[in-house]
């Protein structure tokens, strides 16, 4: 997070995070002096979440929506301190970062892994998918690599257009400066790539958990 910037808006919470928070508060009320075994507690929460109906989850989803709106509202007016570029506010209208070949592969085979091993944690599902990817012949990876390359190409065009649209005066400034900052920007983007993919993986898993319950 923002290395202790007190003005920085608190991060947005997912519906599941609100649910866990509620569970924790309930537990505290019932057992004010008991210490919590977190791995056991989160396992119980996860199990309970899976058995909840869409109606029961609705309350937490509303809380998450409201919190997302709050976060976006606060982020619009938030000015990070000088030098803090990591984890910038992401404009929801910005082109979405393209998935990697592995991420596309995971989208195909995650349902199977989760279906065959219903008790697996998100981490273990990812581990199994990693093994599966490693066991896949290079030739079979090609369709995913081709699609990922296509999406990357499209993203690069879209992001260039998006940046140009966002900075109408940019064209007036010298090209040399732009070239210098381009390399730095690419390095930052690469770091963000990994973070974004991890976030997307988690979001996708949460969505799937919710979909599973709706079936």
């Amino acid at each position: 997070m923002g290395k202790g910037d007190p003005k920085k808006p608190r991060g947005k919470m997912s519906s599941y995070a609100f649910f866990v928070q509620t569970c924790r508060e309930e537990h505290k009320k019932k057992h004010p002096d008991a210490s919590v075994n977190f791995s056991e507690f989160s396992k119980k929460c996860s199990e309970r979440w899976k058995t909840m109906s869409a109606k029961e989850k609705g309350k937490f989803e509303d809380m998450a929506k409201a919190d997302k709106a709050r976060y976006e509202r606060e982020m619009k007016t938030y000015i990070p301190p000088k030098g803090e570029t990591k984890k910038k506010f992401k404009d929801p209208n910005a082109p979405k970062r393209p998935p990697s070949a592995f991420f596309l592969f995971c989208s195909e085979y995650r349902p199977k892994i989760k279906g065959e091993h219903p008790g697996l944690s998100i981490g273990d599902v990812a581990k199994k998918l990693g093994e599966m990817w490693n066991n896949t012949a290079a030739d079979d990876k090609q369709p995913y690599e081709k699609k990922a390359a296509k999406l990357k190409e499209k993203y690069e065009k879209d992001i260039a257009a998006y940046r140009a649209k966002g900075k109408p005066d940019a064209a007036k400034k010298g090209v040399v400066k732009a070239e210098k900052s381009k390399k730095k920007k690419e390095e930052e983007d690469d770091e963000e790539d990994e973070e974004d993919e991890e976030e997307e993986e988690e979001e996708e898993d949460e969505d799937e958990e919710e979909d599973d319950d709706d079936e």
Partner: antibody
Framework: EVQLLESGGGLVQPGGSLRLSCAAS????????MSWVRQAPGKGLEWVSR????????MYADSVKGRFTISRDNSKNTLYLQMNSLRAEDTAVYYC????????????????WGQGTMVTVSS | DIQMTQSPSSLSASVGDRVTITCRAS??????LNWYQQKPGKAPKLLIY???SLQSGVPSRFSGSGSGTDFTLTISSLQPEDFATYYC?????????FGQGTKVEIK
């Protein structure tokens, strides 16, 4: 019981079209890659086409590329092969096969096969 | 495309015999090799995957070995129901290719 059942074969003239179907049962169809494999009378096996679980990725043998189209309907547990511009050399028994992917270091294997449907291209 | 060559093309054997079929790939395919059995008028059946792993439900008299370019299918003691045609298939690259088959007949 895990089962694949092909249909749609028959006699067709050169240049004609045919659509094969393969109905899957006994397993979660939407989890698996599927393929078509054919066998000309008295000959060996020839892989034809493959489709990913979501249907988003497809592959074809050079001999059928541009003429055949593989597709699937996961809501109906059905695999299809649309065959256009048919030639005499396409005459074969067409098998639909389930493809088990990356389970081990050995990549993929056709672990479940249908009984096949005969396609005859002749004038 | 990777060429798969099986030998022999056919063989005659008796019940109880030990039978060995070989398969050679035109380039290294690591352990990306499967073996199938096909009886007349029937669909192929997976016997061995990943060169040496026995498919569930397949009798233990069937075994596979090899890696790289040379592979072997062995039937330790031939049974009456084993008279069929056997195919090797590489899963290393697209297009998937099969050997031409080895027909095991009764002596």
């Amino acid at each position: 019981e895990v089962q694949l059942l092909e249909s749609g074969g028959g006699l067709v003239q050169p240049g004609g079209s045919l659509r094969l179907s393969c109905a899957a049962s006994g397993f979660t169809f939407s989890w698996y890659d599927m393929s078509w494999v054919r066998q000309a009378p008295g000959k060996g096996l020839e892989w034809v086409s493959r489709i990913s679980p979501s249907g988003g990725y497809t592959m074809y043998a050079d001999s059928v590329k541009g003429r055949f189209t593989i597709s699937r309907d996961n809501s109906k547990n059905t695999l299809y092969l649309q065959m256009n511009s048919l030639r005499a050399e396409d005459t074969a028994v067409y098998y639909c096969a389930r493809l088990e992917v990356g389970a081990t270091s050995g990549g993929t294997a056709f672990d479940i096969w249908g009984q096949g449907t005969m396609v005859t291209v002749s004038s | 495309d990777i060429q798969m060559t099986q030998s022999p093309s056919s063989l005659s054997a008796s019940v109880g015999d030990r039978v060995t079929i070989t398969c050679r790939a035109s380039q290294s395919i690591s352990s990306y090799l499967n073996w199938y059995q096909q009886k007349p008028g029937k669909a192929p059946k997976l016997l061995i995957y990943a060169a040496s792993s026995l498919q569930s439900g397949v009798p233990s008299r069937f075994s596979g070995s090899g890696s790289g370019t040379d592979f072997t299918l062995t039937i330790s003691s031939l049974q009456p129901e084993d008279f069929a045609t056997y195919y090797c298939q590489q899963s290393y690259s697209t297009p998937r290719t099969f050997g031409q088959g080895t027909k095991v007949e009764i002596k």
